[in-house]
């Protein structure tokens, strides 16, 4: 079978600072040198692209400067971090991996990681 399998955790809880990290791992059917990773958010049947990065194997992932994502890669594993999350950003975050070069191209889409974001309670005013 030449399909590419992508694995990611089912659930992740964002930190109180609105940061969530998870690992996206793919079983590569070929020897890719260039890989593209995209994070998609699915909520209420709407799908939006959160961020995307293309990297050369052995090099770091480079997201756009204004991206809310950062990441590192190690072999067939990508460690993704999404920051600036609020409660309204709770949803299913899907890892999409594409082996871009050399041909043939392969597509792999994970089942998604449900990220729960809880806005921190505001600190009560204290009178001293």
């Amino acid at each position: 079978c030449k399909a590419m399998h992508v694995a990611q955790p089912a659930v992740v809880l964002a930190s109180s600072r609105g940061i969530a990290s998870f690992v996206c791992e793919y079983a590569s059917p070929g020897k890719a040198t260039e890989v593209r990773v995209t994070v998609l958010r699915q909520a209420d049947s709407q799908v939006t692209e959160v961020c995307a990065a293309t990297y050369m194997m052995g090099n770091e992932l480079t997201f756009l400067d204004d991206s809310i994502c950062t990441g590192t890669s190690s072999g067939n594993q990508v460690n993704l971090t999404i920051q600036g999350l609020r409660a309204m950003d709770t949803g299913l975050y899907i890892c999409k991996v594409e082996l871009m070069y050399p041909p043939p191209y392969y597509l792999g889409i994970g089942n998604g990681t449900q990220i729960y974001v809880i806005d921190p309670e505001p600190c009560p005013d204290s009178d001293f």
């Epitope: 079978c1 293309t54 594409e98 041909p103 392969y106 597509l107 889409i109």
Partner: antibody, heavy 118, light 108 residues
Framework: QVQLVESGGGVVQPGRSLRLSCAAS????????MHWVRQAPGKGLEWVAV????????HYADSVKGRFTISRDNSKNTLYLQMNSLRAEDTAVYYC???????????WGQGTLVTVSS | EIVLTQSPGTLSLSPGERATLSCRAS???????LAWYQQKPGQAPRLLIY???SRATGIPDRFSGSGSGTDFTLTISRLEPEDFAVYYC?????????FGPGTKVDIK
């Protein structure tokens, strides 16, 4: 809304060249993989070529490799297919197609007919 | 290259009947990457089903897809007059992206 409009088709002699264009609107070309798919008269669909995202990667069907070149102009939001050394078997309707977020072919143009005949 | 075979080549049915179209792959296709398209004469193909079973935007629920591995099915639960057309399956999980030869659904 998403719209793809092909142009540039016509009748051409074997061995000659032709360039097809596809004007895209309603989305940004560089955010998607863009494909050309063709259909010979009375036949099925055949994938021809794809250009990925930033344009640095292009993949071709074996039947057109070395003869066809896919490209795009992001400033014009336009996709191209340069077809050289045309053969009779290249006669087909050529469709410009957007690769959707899930990888499927979600939007198709109306097609442009290319006839290679002497 | 993944070769897709569709059967039957032609399906003759009456409006209101159920249509079952088959698509078989030469090697396993992850169900995430199998699509069905409808094409009417003189028109471009239209995406019906992707991921083997997910309906595309605006597609009526009489169209459904199923299957996994090498065997996939498109079912039209109750044929409407506008459903008589050619249907193609396609795998988009690896290049070259391949289509089946099509099944023509015509009026009996």
């Amino acid at each position: 809304q998403v719209q793809l409009v092909e142009s540039g088709g016509g009748v051409v002699q074997p061995g000659r060249s032709l360039r097809l264009s596809c004007a895209a609107s309603g989305f940004t070309l560089s955010s998607y993989g863009m494909h050309w798919v063709r259909q010979a008269p009375g036949k099925g669909l055949e994938w021809v070529a794809v250009i990925w995202y930033d344009g640095s990667n292009k993949h071709y069907a074996d039947s057109v490799k070395g003869r066809f070149t896919i490209s795009r102009d992001n400033s014009k939001n336009t996709l191209y297919l340069q077809m050289n050394s045309l053969r009779a078997e290249d006669t087909a309707v050529y469709y410009c197609v957007r690769g959707g977020i899930w990888g499927n072919f979600d939007y198709w143009g109306q097609g442009t007919l290319v006839t290679v005949s002497s | 290259e993944i070769v897709l075979t569709q059967s039957p080549g032609t399906l003759s049915l009456s409006p209101g009947e159920r249509a079952t179209l088959s698509c078989r792959a030469s090697q396993s296709v992850s169900s995430n990457y199998l699509a069905w398209y409808q094409q009417k004469p003189g028109q471009a193909p239209r995406l019906l089903i992707y991921g083997a079973s997910s309906r595309a935007t605006g597609i009526p629920d009489r169209f459904s897809g199923s299957g996994s591995g090498t065997d996939f099915t498109l079912t039209i639960s109750r044929l409407e007059p506008e459903d008589f057309a050619v249907y193609y399956c396609q795998q988009y999980g690896s290049s070259p992206f391949t289509f089946g030869p099509g099944t023509k659904v015509d009026i009996k």
